[in-house]
């Protein structure tokens, strides 16, 4: 599938298909390039519980447990992104797996992910107008990490 | 920059530029959508130390500290990927920031990242042959997480 990929949808020379001109199946094959979260959630993990499980996926066994929330935008590649949401303000005790330890903070690890947005190509109009992909950085939280609180000098 | 994006560089109809017909800079503009590490590396942070700092970036303050290793491939988009390398087998004590706690394991959080490789287009030969982007899943470690050891049923 050919698309114009550009900064600010303005100046990179390229080709760019119309929304209608490609058969639906043709785009299907590489689109599963969606950024899904690294670790699956376990069925035993209650999405809102602040506890570290002894089994299941990494995000529920972590002492800074998190759940994933879907962020869908039909005009973005990838359409689906997932944000890690920390389930506890502090880290869970390694001993009990449930009580929080105020010595540690559970904080999200952020990352500026490269995404592409579909925009009408510059100067294109009408029903068969072509579309461009515009590169953007999009902030996602990848996971939650247990850290020692920052001590200011 | 217009490119053929396809599975196995074989069958999706699209356009695809020759390596020579586009100036090298054009590729760079969007392939430099390189993924910089989520947390900037601090120049004061000793990358190899198994300790949780009280200042600096998140990867050095974590009780499962990690460093980032650059993985560069000029024929890949993005060209630069970063792998998190855990600096300790166990989590660091929240109290001391240095002694390890055998109750917790420091483990990498893996993610299958979508990348594109530049390949000669199928059936293309000669000096002006065109290039395709071939989609692949590439395993990267995003961070290190402190988890309770898995208890098998």
């Amino acid at each position: 599938v050919s698309l114009r990929i550009q900064e600010g949808c303005s100046h990179l020379p390229s080709c760019c298909p119309s929304k209608e001109q490609e058969p639906p199946e043709e785009w299907l094959k590489w689109s599963s390039a969606s950024v899904s979260p690294p670790e699956p959630l376990s069925h035993t993990h209650h999405a809102e519980s602040c506890r570290a499980s002894k089994d299941g996926p990494l995000n529920s066994r972590a002492i800074s447990p998190w759940s994933y929330e879907l962020d869908r935008d039909l005009n973005r590649v990838p359409q689906d992104l997932y944000h890690a949401r920390c389930l506890c303000p502090h880290c869970v005790s390694l001993q009990t797996g449930s009580h929080m330890d105020p010595l540690g903070n559970s904080v999200p690890l952020y990352h500026n992910q490269t995404v592409f947005y579909r925009r009408p190509c510059h100067g294109e109009e009408g029903t068969h107008r072509r579309y461009c992909l515009e590169r953007r950085l999009y902030r996602v939280s990848l996971a939650c990490v247990c850290v020692r609180p920052r001590v200011m000098a | 920059v217009s490119l053929r994006i396809q599975e196995g560089c074989s069958h999706l109809p699209s356009c695809c530029p020759s390596k020579e017909q586009e100036p090298p800079e054009e590729w760079l503009k969007w392939s430099s959508a390189s993924v910089s590490p989520p947390e900037p590396l601090s120049h004061t942070h000793h990358a190899e130390s198994c300790r949780a700092s009280k200042d600096g970036p998140l990867n050095s303050r974590a009780i499962s500290p990690w460093s980032y290793e650059l993985d560069r491939d000029l024929n890949r988009v993005p060209q630069d990927l970063y792998h998190a390398r855990c600096l300790c087998p166990h989590c660091v004590s929240l109290q001391t920031g240095s002694h390890m706690d055998p109750l917790g394991n420091s483990v990498p959080l893996y993610h299958n990242q979508t990348v594109f490789y530049r390949r000669p287009c199928h059936g293309e030969e000669g000096t002006h042959r065109r290039y395709c982007l071939e989609r692949r899943l590439y395993r990267v470690s995003l961070a290190c997480v402190c988890v309770r050891p898995r208890v098998m049923a």
Partner: antibody, heavy 125, light 107 residues
């Protein structure tokens, strides 16, 4: 063929929780998002949220946030919807619905292409 | 949330009639619209996705059209088995929202 079979009818007291199951067959369970939709007596359809069985990612309607938990058990291809702190106005038929995705892509189109038979949940004191 | 307003809420027609249902979105939904059929026994089926594409196995007497905020669902020649309630649903933005439904009866 694709089939979604839901658990049986439930009667609950206000303040209790209910957990409805939806067993999928005839397709790759982890390859499709599962939606939950409810219908109060004599009313229209109301979307509650969805879960991606492959990675556990969810999206809940704001109205249900904090009261609903959607989970899956991949080993038995089953999705679950748990609703807590039940009220009388939660009396409804609850449906699970598989979300199909269609081209043109990478800009997929989404539609709930297969539905369970529905589970009646009655909340009454 | 995007509001979906469906009309009429009910209608009565004869076998062979052409039946039209409309759905209006509170904002432009870029053709991201589906239509569903709910039979009296509660069974729900997808009929049309992306405004006008028929789902597998759906008879060609069903069709859809529209753009922007205004969409139409048509049954070209009503059959007895079409007695049901019909719903539109937008998937332009989460949360998904449905129209309030149109109950179709035979005269």
């Amino acid at each position: 063929q694709v089939q979604l079979v839901q658990s049986g009818a439930e009667v609950k007291k206000p303040g209790a929780s209910v957990k409805v199951s939806c067993k999928a067959s005839g397709y790759s369970f982890t390859g499709y998002t599962m939606n939950w939709v409810r219908q109060a007596p004599g009313q229209g359809l109301e979307w509650m949220g969805l879960i991606n069985p492959d990675n556990g990612g969810t999206s809940y309607k704001q109205k249900f946030q904090g009261r609903v938990t959607m989970t899956v058990d991949k080993s038995i291809s089953t999705a679950y919807m748990e609703l807590s702190r039940l009220r009388s106005d939660d009396t409804a038929v609850y449906y699970c619905a598989r979300e199909g995705y269609y081209g043109p892509s990478p800009f997929h189109h989404y539609a709930m292409d297969y539905w369970g038979q529905g589970t009646l949940v009655t909340v009454s004191s | 949330d995007i509001q979906m307003t469906q009309s009429p809420s009910s209608l009565s027609a004869s076998v062979g009639d052409r039946v039209t249902i409309t759905c209006q979105a509170s904002q432009d939904i870029s053709n991201y619209l589906n239509w569903y059929q709910q039979k009296p026994d509660g069974t729900i089926k997808l009929l049309i996705y992306y405004t006008s594409t028929l789902h597998t196995g759906v008879p060609s007497r069903f069709s859809g059209s529209g753009s922007g905020t205004d969409y139409t669902f048509t049954i070209s020649s009503l059959q007895p088995e079409d007695i049901a309630t019909y719903y539109c649903q937008q998937y332009s933005k989460l949360p998904y929202t449905f129209g309030q439904g149109t109950k179709l009866e035979i005269k």
